[in-house]
Every structure is written in C-alpha cells, then in structure tokens.
C-alpha cells in the first residue's frame, strides 16, 4: 500500500473495536453456544407469537381503534422478530457479519425502525386513551378505525424517517482478526474537515436523538397521559383499572425495561468517544442490552395473552379452528366437497367466540392471508373477553 493511500477513516472507538480479538476460551465458547440457542429460540417464538397475534387480532376480531394499535405494534414486533434469525446467524459464525454491507444496513434499520415504531405507537395508544377520558365527546366523533390506521401510517413514516441516519451510517468493518463488524461508521458519509469533531458530534447526536425520540418523549407522553386519565377518573370516582389499562401498563413496563438499558449504554458509548475508559464497559454491556431490546418483541405477545382474561383459551380454540379449516381444505380438493366445507366453516364460526375473519365463499389459506394483508379481510363484531379487553372504550 502506498504511503499516500488513506485507509478507511474510522472513529477511534470503532477502530479500537476492530482491534479486539476473539478468544477460543472454553467458557466463552459455552456462553456463545448458549447465546445462539437463546437467540434462535427467541427468533422462533417471536415469529410464531407475533404471527398469531396478527392473525387473531387482525382476522378474527371486530376491528376497533384499540385492535388497530395492537395490530401495528405486533407488525413492528414481527418485523424485529424476522430480523432476529440473521442476528442469531451472526452469533453462530463467531460474531462475524457474513451477509454483506447492504443486508447489514437493512438488518440494523429494522432494529431501529422497531425501536421508533414501538415508542411512537405506545405514545399514540396512551394519547388515545387520554382523549377518550379527557375529551369524550371529541373522541366519540373522531375515534374511528380509519383514523387510527392513518395515525399509524404517519407514525410509521416518522419511524422510517428517524431510521434513515442509521441506515446511512451503518457499515461493515473488517476486524484485524478477520471477523467482520456490522456497526456505526459515522465517518462513512461526508466526514467533514475534522474527523474527531465529526465522530463526537454525530455519535452524540444519534445517541441523544434516539434516547429522546424513541424513549424519553414516549415515556413522558405515556406518563402524562396516565396522570391525566387517573386524575379524571378519580373525579368520577372510578377505581378498578380496565382490562386494556392492564395491557397497556404491561406493554409500557416491558418497553421501559427492555429498551432502558440499551439507551443507557448507547449514551455511554457516545461519552466513550471522549472518555476511552468507558469503552470496555460499553463493549461488554452493549451486546447484552441489544439482545434485551430485541427480546421486547418476543415479550409483547406474551403480555397480550397474560393481561387479557381467557386469552389463552381463545387463542387455543382459534388455532384449533384454523387447523381444522386447513385440514378440511387439504382433504377436499375435489369439487364435491364444497357443501361440507361450507358446513364445517359455519360450525367452526359458531363454535369459536373469535369467529373467522373470512366468509365460506372467500379464498382460503395463503390467498386469504394475502387478502387480509391487502386489507380485504371483513371482520364481524365479537363479544369474547379478549375483544372486550382490546375494544374497551370506557377504561
């Protein structure tokens, strides 16, 4: 290499990370295997759980403003869960990103998109509930499923907008031991006249902005909304929290517990640019808190189940119905089975408190799922406990 060939500029913290070498220590190998197993399990659980929640809430329940929020939260979590297998692969091949720069950018962007979308959606849920209690007349006139979807669309757009810097500044960096990192490289685009200044300002800007926009502001909105609702309900002499309140409380608590440590370490990492003494702490802690943040997407569906009475039973029944429907489809490929298929479907619908989303004459299987994804899923009003919990407007 010629003396004038400038090497890829890296911020000091990133260059030092690239110098860290892997050890083939037995206990470290054991921890790595356990991590791969844990993340693999989380990947599977996350995909299945969020897929089920999307199906049940989106296809088998009366669509309300509340189910709209839950639907979008589950969609965000499903996206994050879908990216987890690739993170598991990264761990499995010895903490090396072997999937290329473009996929590194995309994978990381999904993580941050979920971070922003979760924060924004939880804020919207809290504000929605606040408006219901504080401005009931306005809510009665303006709270529609269509409006909720529009709000969600705006929130997704904001989340995408906030994710752009993380897509731009994500890069693959070769370590000196041959492994590849998929990490921030804030000098990737227009490093400016002074690299030190750029490293400090950009890393701090990213850390502080994500802490504020994806964590502190949402939690402040949630807290103030909760305070406003509590005050109003106290005046009305209402004491017992509604089902949806319990669900929101659980999801918000999980959000704070799972994302809080990540933001703490992210801010520490920004400080570590000027304070190298913090770097070892960040290097050790960041992988753990990042995984914890990922696991929030796996925890949410569990919380939906635990905080809604009889949810587990309804889910079980609902899944059995789906299974029966699929089995009937497979066994009656001939034209003669259509009447029995119709009869089975109607029986299934009456048997399940969570009635099927599609009508007997509608397409089945993948076509039906596609139809729902494209918005053609006709939902009929239900009265099951889960639905009451999710569509409760009084609490």
């Amino acid at each position: 290499m010629s003396a004038n060939a400038t090497l890829k500029p890296l911020c000091p913290i990133l260059e030092q990370m690239s110098r860290l070498q892997s050890h083939s220590n037995t206990s470290i190998r054991y921890i790595d295997h356990a991590a791969v197993l844990l993340h693999g399990l989380a990947s599977l659980l996350g995909l299945v759980e969020n897929g089920v929640i999307l199906f049940v809430v989106g296809c088998r329940m009366r669509q309300t403003v509340v189910t709209t929020w839950v639907l979008h939260l589950a969609l965000s979590d499903l996206l994050a869960s879908a990216s987890l297998p690739f993170f598991t692969y990264f761990l499995a091949v010895g903490h090396s990103w072997e999937l290329g720069t473009t996929f590194c950018k995309l994978h990381s962007s999904i993580f941050f998109l979920n971070m922003f979308a979760s924060g924004f959606l939880l804020s919207a849920i809290s504000l929605d509930r606040c408006l219901q209690v504080v401005r009931p007349v306005w809510a009665q006139n303006h709270r529609t499923v269509a409006a909720a979807h529009k709000v969600c669309l705006v929130l997704w757009a904001l989340a995408v907008l906030n994710t752009v810097p993380y897509f731009v500044f994500r890069d693959t960096i070769s370590r000196l031991d041959g492994r590849i990192m998929c990490y921030y490289n804030v000098l990737l685009l227009n490093p400016g006249p002074d690299r030190d200044a750029t490293c400090n300002s950009r890393q701090a800007a990213l850390a502080v902005s994500k802490f504020l926009l994806a964590f502190l502001v949402p939690l402040a909105i949630i807290a103030s909304s909760h305070a406003a609702v509590s005050l109003r309900l106290q005046h009305r002499g209402r004491r017992r929290p509604g089902r949806f309140v319990r669900l929101v409380a659980a999801v918000v608590a999980a959000f704070a517990l799972c994302w809080g440590p990540y933001h703490v370490f992210s801010l520490l990492e920004a400080r570590a640019h000027a304070n190298p003494g913090l770097r070892p702490l960040v290097w050790r802690g960041l992988p753990f808190v990042t995984s914890l943040a990922f696991f929030n997407s796996v925890a949410n569906p569990v919380l939906y189940v635990l905080t809604c009475p009889d949810m587990l039973r309804k889910l079980r029944r609902s899944l059995r119905t789906v299974l029966e429907s699929v089995l009937v489809d497979d066994s009656e490929l001939g034209g003669a089975g259509s009447s029995r298929r119709r009869r089975t479907s109607s029986t299934a619908r009456s048997a399940s408190p969570l009635a099927l989303c599609s009508r007997p004459e509608e397409p089945r299987g993948p076509a039906r799922l596609l139809g729902w994804l494209l918005g053609s899923c006709a939902a009929s009003p239900q009265t099951g406990p889960l639905n009451r919990a999710l569509s409760s407007t009084s609490s």
């Epitope: 000091p12 002074d194 690299r195």
Partner: antibody
Framework: EVQLVESGGGLVQPGGSLRLSCAAS????????MSWVRQAPGKGLEWVAR????????DYPGTVEGRFTISRDNSKNTLYLQMNSLRAEDTAVYYC???????????WGQGTLVTVSS | DIQMTQSPSSLSASVGDRVTITCRAS??????LAWYQQKPGKAPKLVVY???QLADGVPSRFSGSGSGTDYTLTISSLQPEDFATYYC?????????FGQGTKVEIK
C-alpha cells in the same frame, strides 16, 4: 514519497519560548492526525502532543500541558509546536510524526534538537 | 498514567538467533500497542501496530503477539540490520507512554 522536515530548534534559556515547525509533503496532510514526540539525549521516547486532522482536538501529557501548544495549517501543510516556559528537562530531539490511522506513528521526521540551558 | 515496562533492557544475540522482547502494561490496553525500531542517530520506524499487525515493508521475520497487559515482539531469525533499540508504545488512554527500550546488540 512521504517527507516530514522539522525546523526551529536551537538553544534557548530556561523560561524562554520556541516555535517548532514541521513541513509535510508526499501525502494529503489534512487527512492525517499528527503528533510531536521527543527524545532526551541518551534516553527513551516521550509523546508530547497530538492534533486531529482538522485541528479541532489536541491532547498533551501532564508534563507539558499548559506550556506547549500544538497547531497546524492545512493550507501550508505545516505542523507547529509552540513551547513556552521552557525548562532544562525539555532538552531533547523533537520529532514530528504522522499517525497511521488514529494511532501508530508510521512516518517520522529526522528531528530537531532543542537545548534549554542558561 | 499507564506504565510500560520492557524487558530485557538490553540483550546480546547472534545473527540467526530467535529474539523475544516483552512489554508489560500496568493495565489492560486492549491490543492498542505499537513496536518501533530505532537505530543510532535516526528516527524511529514503525514495525508492528495493533499488537499483531506488521507495518508496510517490514520483513516477515518480525511478529507481534499478546493481549491484555502482556505483549511480545519476536524476531525469528536475527539479521545484521536488526541490531537496534526497540520501543513499545501503548495507544489506549492518553498520555501514550513508551517502554524504556530494549537494545539488541551483536554478541
């Protein structure tokens, strides 16, 4: 070919001042961090100062902090070391060095001798 | 400040010998270590950076190893041009300090 040429050394009295220069050529000066390193006669090496590629960040060891100031003029491809309140223990050959990346001095000048004596 | 202790301070060896110089830091420096070679009246020359990486143009008989606080520079087969003083330097937390040097002399 990378070249670093120091100048400005000489004999100075204790408490006096001196300004060292380092003319750089053969590479894009504004892309590299730079440092000054000194070596007392018959002794080991001591890092003295460091400056970021744009000049916004500087670092010094406690032995020279407050007395020495590192600066650069990227338009002139020149690095400077302003030395004030000089002491006898500052007597050394002063080298300017280019950083390979954020660290590791990959190119050094031939050095300039600074003697602090009354 | 991080102290860098080099050993031995001097050694006598013959051409073709295997030479090992060690450098111990007073705390973990996370591979942020460089080795320099200096000949009398000349400026130092970078030999190894990041503890294990050979600098451009340095012969493969030189190698660096180590982790944590203990690092080593090895010359597998000493050549006449390798007789010089070798310094280690850490780049972890400022001030970046050097070892006191190891003088490799002809036996």
């Amino acid at each position: 070919e990378v070249q670093l040429v120091e100048s400005g050394g000489g004999l100075v009295q204790p408490g006096g001042s001196l300004r060292l220069s380092c003319a750089a050529s053969g590479f894009t000066f504004s892309s590299y961090l730079m440092s000054w390193v000194r070596q007392a006669p018959g002794k080991g090496l001591e890092w003295v100062a460091r400056i970021s590629n744009g000049g916004s960040t500087t670092d010094y060891p406690g032995t020279v902090e407050g007395r020495f100031t590192i600066s650069r003029d990227n338009s002139k491809n020149t690095l400077y070391l302003q030395m004030n309140s000089l002491r006898a223990e500052d007597t050394a050959v002063y080298y300017c060095a280019r950083h390979r990346t954020n660290w590791d001095f990959d190119y050094w000048g031939q050095g300039t001798l600074v003697t602090v004596s009354s | 400040d991080i102290q860098m202790t080099q050993s031995p301070s001097s050694l006598s060896a013959s051409v073709g010998d295997r030479v090992t110089i060690t450098c111990r830091a007073s705390e973990n420096i996370y591979y942020n270590l460089a080795w320099y070679q200096q000949k009398p009246g000349k400026a130092p020359k970078l030999v190894v950076y990041a503890a294990t990486q050979l600098a451009d143009g340095v012969p493969s008989r030189f190698s660096g190893s180590g982790s944590g606080t203990d690092y080593t520079l090895t010359i597998s087969s000493l050549q006449p041009e390798d007789f010089a003083t070798y310094y280690c330097q850490h780049f972890w937390i400022t001030p970046w300090t050097f070892g006191q040097g190891t003088k490799v002399e002809i036996k």
